[in-house]
């Protein structure tokens, strides 16, 4: 018979032959032959593989480094990685939670809608028209543009979401 060009799900093609992939939690020791099945071995302690695979090495479990404020949220198994979270009151910097911050700052152009708590991180909101923020802050709201009119001045430069308006003297018409 013709050698296969494609294999079924949970199989892989090698040496013109379809071999079974190793199940999650196991790594490949040797490919199958005409006479033998694929040989797989369980991952060691602190290792995992989370898919049907033909990997010859298992992945190391993630280390939740206490020096970065991390602790184990869920211990890894032979089929799953360790899940880290931050110490109480601290917040993950990303979905992968590789480091912790006390809270995030809102960038210029954004103001703080809600200051961080032990449970939730800073909530930012864009400064609407008429308001601005020119700093990165974890507590400052958007500030209203200066009202030039109340100072008997005129707008010389329009404000943006990141800058205040610039006021200047009114042009005096000469007689």
């Amino acid at each position: 018979p013709e050698p296969p060009t494609a294999c079924r799900e949970k199989q892989y093609l090698i040496n013109s032959q379809c071999c079974s992939l190793c199940q999650p939690g196991q790594k490949l020791v040797s490919d199958c032959t005409e006479f033998t099945e694929t040989e797989c071995l369980p991952c060691g302690e602190s290792e995992f593989l989370d898919t049907w695979n033909r990997e010859t090495h298992c992945h190391q479990h993630k280390y939740c480094d206490p020096n970065l404020g991390l602790r184990v949220q869920q211990k890894g198994t032979s089929e799953t990685d360790t899940i880290c979270t931050c110490e109480e009151g601290w917040h993950c910097t990303s979905e992968a939670c590789e480091s912790c911050v006390l809270h995030r700052s809102c960038s210029p152009g954004f103001g703080v809608k809600q200051i961080a708590t032990g449970v939730s991180d800073t909530i930012c909101e864009p400064c609407p028209v008429g308001f601005f923020s020119n700093v990165s802050s974890a507590f400052e709201k958007c500030h209203p543009w200066t009202s030039c009119e109340t100072k008997d001045l005129v707008v010389q430069q329009a404000g943006t979401n990141k800058t205040d308006v610039v006021c200047g003297p009114q042009d005096r018409l000469r007689a």
Partner: nanobody, 116 residues
């Protein structure tokens, strides 16, 4: 290397006062927003007070409003927290923190104990 060193804590009676300091080194202090946070025994972190990079804006948690005052001296690279009318519930380790507020930037803290 960024370093924050808190000092000024101690044992004080209810109604008393303390002034905490946070000496910074390893970065240009001026222009950075700075925070005081605290952790009471067996409790989570509480954000106490903050001061803007310019010193023109401040924030106080409701629990300390009217009793605590935050200030900064950029020439001395030092942040302060003046604490008056202290209460038993102010007992905690107090830390200062700077943007970007990484866990590894925090200082060792200074313990404030309010007890008679």
């Amino acid at each position: 290397e960024v370093q924050l060193l808190e000092s000024g804590g101690g044992l004080v009676q209810p109604g008393g006062s303390l002034r905490l300091s946070c000496a910074a080194s390893g970065f240009t202090f001026a222009g950075y927003e700075l925070w005081w946070v605290r952790q009471a025994p067996g409790k989570g972190l509480e954000r106490v007070s903050a001061i803007s990079g310019s010193g023109g804006s401040t924030y106080y948690a409701d629990s300390v409003k009217g009793r605590f005052t935050i200030s900064r001296d950029d020439s001395k690279n030092t942040l302060y927290l003046q604490m008056n009318s202290l209460r038993a519930e102010d007992t905690a380790v107090y830390y200062c923190a700077k943007d970007p507020y990484s866990f590894d930037y925090r200082g060792q803290g200074t313990l404030v104990t309010v007890s008679s």
